[in-house]
């Protein structure tokens, strides 16, 4: 049994880091493998993560962490029984993938303005809480070409757009994702999408 593709990990910078790797053949990850992890400076017992299958030869493990600070560095040991298959390290602050925003809501009752709001996925005491910026994706269910991205570079989790920038009388969907420049993170996953029917009064045209 050998590791074909070494573990790569990303952290949500709160409580979970996710590591993925590939073995050289079909593997029952949860029964055959264990990923042990511990902060490098500790002589305490390592934590054990039981991996799950992620495709035939792929494994994924969700490492639980009390909290995360920028200094944290973990040793990682991948074991198959008594055999050490791979040894490495992982610094969560250098591999951050933020949590996805939630509770995306479209408010359509504000005088021809669409107000989109969502929730910051971090509690106020987390470093990322005040460092997230967002991208909002709006698209038409009827017209695949009608697809747009709005970058929200301020901290408030909301976006206002004129309803007239979208077509009237058709349904749209929106979703939002987050990233943090301070840690050069990857983008989060998209939030679940929300749907609304766009309608507004066309301005009266005088000839």
């Amino acid at each position: 049994m050998k590791v074909l593709q070494e573990p790569t990990c990303v952290s949500d910078y709160m409580s979970i880091s996710t590591c993925e790797w590939k073995m050289n053949g079909p593997t029952n990850c949860s029964t055959e493998l264990r990923l042990l992890y511990q902060l490098v400076f500790l002589l305490s017992e390592a934590h054990t993560c039981i991996p799950e299958n992620n495709g035939g030869a792929g494994c994924v493990c969700h490492l639980l962490m009390d909290d995360v600070v920028s200094a944290d560095n973990y040793t990682l040991d991948l074991w198959a029984g008594q055999q050490l298959l791979w040894k490495g390290s992982f610094k969560p602050s250098e591999h951050v993938k933020p949590r996805a925003p939630g509770n995306l809501t479209v408010h359509t009752n504000v005088s021809d303005t669409l107000l989109l709001t969502w929730s910051n996925p971090y509690p106020p005491d987390n470093y990322l809480y005040n460092h997230l910026t967002y991208a909002v994706n709006i698209w038409s269910e009827n017209d695949p070409a009608d697809f747009r991205i709005y970058n929200v570079t301020y901290l408030e989790p909301s976006l206002r757009i004129a309803a007239s920038t979208l077509k009237s009388g058709i349904s749209y969907r929106a979703r939002v994702r987050a990233w943090a420049q301070c840690y050069n993170t990857t983008w989060s996953e998209w939030s679940p999408s929300t749907k609304w029917h766009n309608s507004y009064r066309e301005p009266f045209e005088q000839h």
């Epitope: 902060l39 400076f41 500790l42 002589l43 305490s44 017992e45 009390d66 909290d67 600070v69 920028s70 200094a71 944290d72 560095n73």
Partner: antibody, heavy 117, light 107 residues
């Protein structure tokens, strides 16, 4: 709640031996590295020794190497420090401490060791 | 071994003052630095870990900063209960080592 209670301190002559113990409760003792830290009267803190959760790794400050031995009994939730060939400069309050993500996260109240002729 | 050097070794300050204590490591310690407060006859109390992370229950008037080899503990507005001795400590590599301490006294 976490409790660490040191015992075994006292007055001893130079060259003699003393054994300190630390009784731990309120956490899974066998899972954590444990440390001894000391403080001479009116002086600063000095880290002395550490033992890994399973006893397989031990580290000491240079001034006590070969004289002090750190050990643990995970079945009794007890940390020990065997101190041989004691010197006047070993006089201090000895604290046991549990390690955590911030270095030390819990300390005992300490036990005083006085080396005097 | 990594040497930790604190400055000043003592300082006099008044209630309400902003106080800064510095700590220098003899080599890079990867931000594995803690700050402790100790009052006479008492057990050291942890204030900061990982150079800048406040321990649970510690008031926000305490803050830590720095990286690499140079670190700072700041008390934004000194209160009567803050007069004590403060120690930095590195836990990057064994032997873990403390600074010699900074005694904060009433002016």
């Amino acid at each position: 709640q976490v409790q660490l209670v040191e015992s075994g301190g006292g007055v001893v002559q130079p060259g003699r031996s003393l054994r300190l113990s630390c009784a731990a409760s309120g956490f899974t003792f066998r899972s954590y590295g444990m440390h001894w830290v000391r403080q001479a009267p009116g002086k600063g803190l000095e880290w002395v020794a550490v033992i890994s959760y399973d006893g397989s790794n031990k580290y000491y400050i240079d001034s006590v190497k070969g004289r002090f031995t750190i050990s643990r009994d995970n079945s009794k939730n007890t940390l020990n420090l065997q101190m041989n060939s004691l010197r006047l400069e070993d006089t201090a309050v000895y604290y046991c401490a549990k390690e955590g993500r911030g270095g030390f996260d819990y300390w005992g109240q300490g036990t005083l060791v006085t080396v005097s002729s | 071994d990594i040497q930790m050097t604190q400055s000043p070794s003592s300082l006099s300050a008044s209630v309400g003052d902003r106080v800064t204590i510095t700590c220098r490591a003899s080599q890079v310690i990867n931000n594995y630095l803690a700050w402790f407060q100790q009052k006479p006859g008492k057990v050291p109390k942890s204030l900061i870990h990982a150079a800048s992370s406040l321990q649970s229950g510690v008031p926000s008037k305490f803050s830590g900063s720095g990286s690499g080899t140079d670190f700072t503990l700041t008390i934004s507005s000194l209160q009567p209960e803050d007069f004590a001795t403060y120690y930095c400590q590195q836990y990057n590599s064994h032997p873990w080592t403390f600074g010699q301490g900074t005694k904060v006294e009433i002016k």
